[in-house]
């Protein structure tokens, strides 16, 4: 080994070197949180880039660049360091017009903490391993969600558009003539029934066990879906989103109540099956795989 390489190895394995890099990263993160950084922080920025460059040079001199098994670029953690340095020099010395997008990559510096702290490295390693192992579970999850989304599409397509519409039309008024004149939400409230404090018109249905309209109102299927049009089973993609919402239990009881009011109470069976299979079984299966991957990584 050349003297330069010997010195590089000594620096690299020294605990103070790791401490210096860790402190640099943390200080860099603190500086990145500043809203309006003063002018002198520019020089500090150069210092950080210098330290990172020095760290990478030490690693390259000690281990070699890319030829050989244990060289610098053969370690995925060093790819991050390399990208950080490349972007640091790119944003500083190359005129690329609007560099605000490139400046975003400075955030990657915070990720360098992972490669320095051993505990974090284990966790992230486990996370990456679990993602690899999750592929089969993810395929199963997407398949199950797709199947139930298709069932939901068939059962509830258009149902959430049902609204309670005022019965008392003038002599030559039609639903279309009214809809053409409606502009503001206030206009809608004149013709459609709204519960107090509700943003959407009262849902209703045409089956005997679905929600009925109050006296003087009739159930029509018109206008947009609830929640600004985001809650529906009208297309496969919206149905899939609704099913994902059920699986993650994200305010799912509202979707459940809306759908049951529009379609009928019988359809609670659909929701029971989805919650049991999607929310209780699949979610826990995902957690089990992650736990297994973490256990393997620890061993």
């Amino acid at each position: 080994f050349s003297p330069l390489r010997r010195i590089s190895i000594k620096i690299l394995v020294h605990s103070l070197f790791s401490m210096l890099i860790m402190c640099t990263i943390l200080t860099n993160c603190i500086f990145m949180t500043m809203n309006n950084p003063p002018d002198w922080t520019k020089n500090v920025e150069y210092t950080f880039t210098g330290i990172y460059t020095f760290e990478s040079l030490v690693k390259i001199l000690a281990r070699g660049f890319c030829v050989g098994e244990f060289t610098f670029l053969r370690d995925p953690w060093n790819w991050l360091d390399f990208v950080v340095i490349v972007f640091a020099y790119l944003t500083e010395f190359v005129n690329l017009g609007n560099v605000s997008a490139l400046r975003t990559f400075r955030v990657l510096r915070a990720l360098k903490t992972i490669s320095v702290i051993p505990g974090l490295k284990t966790i992230v390693g486990a996370l990456i391993q679990s993602v690899k192992k999750l592929s089969d579970v993810m395929i199963l999850t997407v398949f199950c969600l797709s199947v139930f989304a298709l069932i939901g599409l068939q059962l509830f397509m258009g149902n959430l558009k049902h609204k309670c519409f005022r019965n008392s039309l003038e002599n030559n008024e039609t639903l279309e003539s009214i809809m053409n004149t409606l502009e503001s939400e206030e206009d809608f409230r004149k013709y459609f029934y709204y519960l107090e404090g509700s943003k959407d018109a009262l849902l209703c249905g045409f089956s005997t066990d679905s929600g009925q309209c109050p006296e003087g109102y009739t159930c029509v299927k018109i206008g947009r879906n609830p929640d600004y049009g985001y809650t529906s089973f009208d297309t496969f993609s919206w149905a899939f989103l609704a099913l994902f919402r059920l699986m993650t239990q994200d305010y799912w009881e509202n979707l459940y109540q809306q759908t049951l009011r529009a379609a009928g109470k019988t359809y609670m069976i659909f929701f029971v099956v989805v919650i049991f299979l999607g929310s209780f079984y699949l979610i826990n299966l995902i957690l089990a795989v992650v736990a297994m991957a973490y256990e393997e990584q620890n061993q």
């Epitope: 039309l169 639903l175 045409f206 009739t218 299927k221």
Partner: nanobody
Amino acid sequence: EVQLVESGGGLVQPGGSLRLSCVASGGIININYIAWYRQTPGKQRDLVARISSDDTIKYGDSVKGRFAMSRDKVKNMVHLQMNSLTTEDTGVYVCSALITPWTGDTRTYWGRGTLVTVSS
């Protein structure tokens, strides 16, 4: 496809009676209301009678007390019994219904109309 078909029109003498029928067919989930309109040349369509889903019936001012509307919910059908007809009642009687079909949104459907001529 939802269709409205009227029948029962024809020539009748003043003071006579006529019974019009309108049947809705196709993929129907719900009928919110069915109405009869009278279309006369050079004039707009005037409401004759309208029956809502809750069986509330509204009559036009010119026919009150003379015309009677009834509904057969099972057959998706309405009847308009016209009594004491006058020459003023002459026109094309068009059936209209606010229907929710299996596919698509609730909208107003119109029939082609049936001609009623009151003349001596």
